[in-house]
Interface confidence: medium
């Protein structure tokens, strides 16, 4: 591989790597504008820091330290910065691959678990705000009522509920969009850890080519 | 053509369960609501709630909470409502009916006649 | 819970003549999308319940011309022009407006 094929080598990584950094600013800046103008409340008691907010944030931080890694890396040929940037990456892959056997495998569990943590969050309505706000956003935004329908309000149920006559539960219609989109979800989440693959690879073929061009020139 | 299929009768002691059926045939099953309907020996009909089987979403009659729990078998194409902690006041015939979407209960099973009984 | 009352609670009726049954909501069944959600039903002896008629008005397929729905809001009755042995039975008109679902009482219709 010649001085080119390193040069364009490593110009995709910066250019690609700039994309998503911009993209981690992007979902970041969400992520805190929704923990400032906070609508959306708790919706499990028992994991009060699992807010929309708090996700995107997470999700926008990760993906730009990253992203600067590997532009950073790339443009100024560091090799340990390559590395710490092929090492995260490794990591979220690995992480995300367990996750999805998890989620596969106790996909029966997981679903009790909600059930159970939405139905606590249903009691907790009338007398907590944020419990309240996170229904409220849930049911209008969705167009649903309750976990799995009008019964699960014991007192009736609220205002946000929408007056369709034949209303569907909000975590019944969920499972049902995933279940109906899984194909698609199976797509994006395996084009994602394409893009990660072809990110280490990337990383690593650039590692290796700055060695040999050390090598070359004498270094 | 849409037929609703429901067993003839059970006779249970007080204070047991029962699971009726409701098996559904000549349509797509997961498309339609599926009603449950009440009727006491020479009274009137009671609504107890219906059930949509694709998602699972159930919307009940408040009156039947705690008492009845509705449920759907896609693959068998079956709807099943649950009757717990029986009385004599349970004595009744029960109905599955199909939901139009657009309106109301436009085809009608036979009925199941519960007996809670000692 | 909306109360649907109806009246009369029985009614004996000769062969050809007309029958009128009333249905009175104790609050409006205009629904949000400009539909009223009455429906009137048929049980004959020993039978499963029949919808005769729906949206208020709406015949379903099958069900004799002679049978007619009307009203709007909360007042609606079903008219059987020219009554037949046939029609023996009680018939119960439902609510869909509002959970939970609710009957009226229901009319028993016997032929003199």
């Known amino acids: 591989m010649g001085m080119s094929s390193l040069k364009l080598l490593k110009y995709v990584l910066f250019f690609f790597n700039l994309l998503f950094w911009i993209c981690g600013c992007c979902i970041l800046g969400f992520g805190i504008y929704l923990l400032i103008h906070n609508n959306f409340g708790v919706l499990f008691h028992n994991l009060p820091s699992l807010t929309l907010g708090n996700v995107f944030v997470i999700v926008g931080s990760i993906i730009m330290v990253v992203a600067f890694l590997g532009c950073m890396g790339s443009i100024k040929e560091n090799k340990c910065l390559l590395m710490s940037f092929f090492i995260l990456l490794l990591i979220i892959l690995l992480a995300e691959v367990t996750l999805a056997i998890l989620l596969f495998v106790y996909e029966q569990k997981l679903n009790e678990y909600v059930a159970k943590g939405l139905t606590d969050s249903i009691h907790r309505y009338h007398s907590d705000n944020s419990t309240k706000a996170a229904w409220d956003s849930i049911q209008s935004f969705l167009q649903c009522c309750g976990i799995n329908g009008t019964s699960d309000w014991t007192s009736g149920p609220p205002a946000s509920c929408p007056s369709d006559r034949k209303v569907e539960g909000c975590y019944a219609k969920a499972r049902l969009w995933f279940h109906s989109n899984f194909l698609y979800i199976g797509i994006i989440t395996i084009c994602v850890c394409v893009i990660e693959v072809l990110g280490m690879s990337f990383a690593l073929t650039l590692n290796c080519q700055i060695d040999k061009t050390s090598q070359t020139i004498g270094l | 053509q849409v037929q609703l299929q429901q067993p003839g009768a059970e006779l249970v002691k007080p204070g047991a369960s029962v699971k009726l059926s409701c098996k559904a045939s000549?349509?797509?099953?997961?498309?339609?609501?599926m009603h449950w309907v009440k009727q006491r020996p020479g009274q009137g009909l009671e609504w107890i709630g219906m059930?949509?089987?694709?998602?699972?979403?159930?919307n009940h009659n408040g009156k039947f909470r705690g008492k009845a729990t509705l449920t759907v078998d896609k693959s068998s194409s079956t709807a099943y409502i649950q009757l717990s902690s029986l009385t004599s006041e349970d004595s009744a015939v029960y109905y599955c009916a199909r939901d139009d979407y657009a309106e109301t209960m436009d085809y009608w099973g036979q009925g199941t006649s519960v007996t809670v009984s000692s | 819970d909306v109360v649907m009352t109806q009246t009369p609670l029985s009614l004996s009726i000769t062969i050809g003549q007309p029958a009128s049954i009333s249905c009175k909501s104790s609050q409006s069944l205009l629904y949000s999308d400009g539909k009223t959600y009455l429906n009137w039903f048929q049980q004959r002896p020993g039978q499963s319940p029949k919808r005769l008629m729906y949206q208020v008005s709406k015949l379903d397929p099958g069900i004799p011309d002679r049978f007619s729905g009307s009203g709007s809001e909360t007042d609606f009755t079903l008219k059987i022009s020219r009554v037949e042995a046939e029609d023996l039975g009680v018939y119960y008109c439902?609510?869909?407006?509002?959970?939970?679902?609710?009957f009226g009482g229901g009319t028993k219709l016997e032929i003199k």
């Open positions: 059930i949509h089987p694709n998602s699972g979403s159930s």
């Open positions: 439902l609510q869909g407006t509002y959970y939970p679902w609710t």
């Open positions: 000549g349509y797509t099953f997961t498309s339609y609501w």
